[in-house]
């Protein structure tokens, strides 16, 4: 069971990143699915290595004081959403903006029907060029 | 099937990074090989988690305007070279140069005879000290 | 065999990061254990994908000239400690400090009783908020 999906620019104002089965994507079988273009949902309980990579372009003067944060989050059936992993990068002083990449990854126990998704502080700063921003998992 | 190879400084002017089976490297068996010191080639079709880490040292004034980009690329038999993953980091203002690390990783379907390699915008900026820059894969 | 442990602030002056089985941690069975809150120790020989993520907050003026370096290290029975992976990030000019995240990961052969741990140049700069700093492995 494995998946690798590709970022998709979105007109939505949500902080949850959008993904698509496009380009050199992976969706091994129907035991993992991409739901609503925003979350990877698994049908089998078990240990999964889950990862996300986010490339963004920001400028210190044009951004809020707070850093750019990418969060890998979990929604299990009958449970509240929770953060699994976070990474933070301070905005660049480069103009018009400076690109930076964040990589998150870890091993987590998922229940049947559990969904994982990626949140960012400012989706408008995310880079969607080939290979820059992606999201995936593999069952151990 | 798994491999982990270590960066090697090169006098070549190519943007493709060079690797060696040295230090604490891994080469599980002959179903994955390091070819010409530049690419990992697999003999078996399947899903692979492929990763690379690149540490580099650069300075904004001494570098081009463009960020430092590391790309994980694929060459499959009978197909053309393509990008799987990219990461970008804007150059540091630290002098003489500021070190930064990039990590790439994802799950991809590889065909028999497929090769993966790592491209960077400026190989002369790459750090080759122990553990700083490496490249590997594992078959799921 | 898999583990994922969560960073723990420590009053110790050691450069070795401290970890705990807390939050959304993983410890699949007793073939991998967290020893002294500082190292993951495996009982079985084999290939492991080992990873660490470290988020830190530093300022160029308040830090040494040297970059922030995170190292993944190995101690095998009857062998000296050695570095497996390192990543480096130059300190930010943001005030009071600028957050940055480092991700390390690779495939390594471990012997029975081998331990892996994470060293950083300045543990006081490490961020311990939910999901920011973690450490884990999985047996292939």
């Amino acid at each position: 069971i494995a998946a690798h999906v590709i970022s998709e620019a979105s007109s939505k104002t949500t902080s949850v990143l959008q993904w698509a089965e496009k380009g050199y994507y992976t969706m091994s079988n129907n035991l993992v699915t991409l739901e609503n273009g925003k979350q990877l949902t698994v049908k089998r309980q078990g240990l999964y290595y889950i990862y996300a990579q986010v490339t963004f372009c920001s400028n210190r003067e044009a951004s809020s004081q707070a850093p750019f944060i990418a969060s890998l989050c979990l929604k299990s059936p009958g449970r509240f959403e929770r953060i699994l992993l976070r990474a933070a990068n301070t905005h660049s002083s480069a103009k018009p903006c400076g690109q930076q990449s964040i990589h998150l990854g870890g091993v987590f126990e998922l229940q049947p029907g559990a969904s994982v998704f990626v949140n960012v502080t400012d989706p408008s700063q995310v880079s969607h060029g080939t290979g820059f921003t992606s999201f995936g998992l593999l069952k151990l | 099937i798994a491999a982990h190879v270590i960066s090697e400084a090169s006098s070549k002017t190519t943007s493709v990074l060079q690797w060696a089976e040295k230090g604490y490297y891994t080469m599980s068996n002959n179903l994955v090989t390091l070819e010409n010191g530049k690419q990992l080639t697999v003999k078996r079709q399947g899903l692979y988690y492929i990763y690379a880490q690149v540490t580099f040292c650069s300075n904004r004034e001494a570098s081009s305007q463009a960020p430092f980009i590391a790309s994980l690329c694929l060459k499959s038999p009978g197909r053309f070279e393509r990008i799987l993953l990219r990461a970008a980091n804007t150059h540091s203002s630290a002098k003489p140069c500021g070190q930064q690390s990039i990590h790439l990783g994802g799950v991809f379907e590889l065909q028999p005879g497929a090769s993966v390699f790592v491209n960077v915008t400026d190989p002369s900026q790459v750090s080759h000290g122990t553990g700083f820059t490496s490249f590997g894969l594992l078959k799921l | 065999i898999a583990a994922h442990v969560i960073s723990e602030a420590s009053s110790k002056t050691t450069s070795v990061l401290q970890w705990a089985e807390k939050g959304y941690y993983t410890m699949s069975n007793n073939l991998v254990t967290l020893e002294n809150g500082k190292q993951l120790t495996v009982k079985r020989q084999g290939l492991y994908y080992i990873y660490a993520q470290v988020t830190f907050c530093s300022n160029r003026e308040a830090s040494s000239q040297a970059p922030f370096i995170a190292s993944l290290c190995l101690k095998s029975p009857g062998r000296f400690e050695r570095i497996l992976l390192r990543a480096a990030n130059t300190h930010s000019s943001a005030k009071p400090c600028g957050q940055q995240s480092i991700h390390l990961g690779g495939v390594f052969e471990l012997q029975p009783g081998a331990s892996v741990f994470v060293n950083v140049t300045d543990p006081s700069q490490v961020s311990h908020g939910t999901g920011f700093t973690s450490f884990g492995l999985l047996k292939l």
């Epitope: 496009k22 969607h128 060029g129 080939t130 | 980009i69 197909r79 053309f80 | -």
Partner: nanobody, 116 residues
Framework: EVQLLESGGGLVQPGGSLRLSCAAS????????MAWVRQAPGKGLEWVST????????YYADSVKGRFTISRDNSKNTLYLQMNSLRAEDTAVYYC?????????WGQGTLVTVSS
């Protein structure tokens, strides 16, 4: 239906320059990596260059590095190959290619002949 129409080929002397164009239609051009490949008389297809969808990353075969430049204009759905310092061994039919997951699509090609 994917269509790729190459143009700009011709006869040129060694050391000369040419600019090839490839007009793309039938797909969302800006979402795909693109490449130039070539086939010399009596030889197999040879990869020349690849460009990312955003144009930020470019890759070249060692044989053309420093002489050829790949670029794209996503607003015009067009791929380009600027070829300088041409050599006799660059003589070939040049094809532009759309890089998809399962297949690489390419056009009819344009002939480049380098001869004095």
């Amino acid at each position: 239906e994917v269509q790729l129409l190459e143009s700009g080929g011709g006869l040129v002397q060694p050391g000369g320059s040419l600019r090839l164009s490839c007009a793309a239609s039938g797909f969302t051009f800006a979402r795909y990596q693109m490449a130039w490949v070539r086939q010399a008389p009596g030889k197999g297809l040879e990869w020349v260059s690849t460009i990312s969808d955003d144009g930020d990353s470019t890759y070249y075969a060692d044989s053309v590095k420093g002489r050829f430049t790949i670029s794209r204009d996503n607003s015009k759905n067009t791929l380009y190959l600027q070829m300088n310092s041409l050599r006799a061994e660059d003589t070939a039919v040049y094809y532009c290619a759309k890089l998809d997951k399962l297949f690489d699509y390419w056009g009819q090609g344009t002939l480049v002949t380098v001869s004095s």
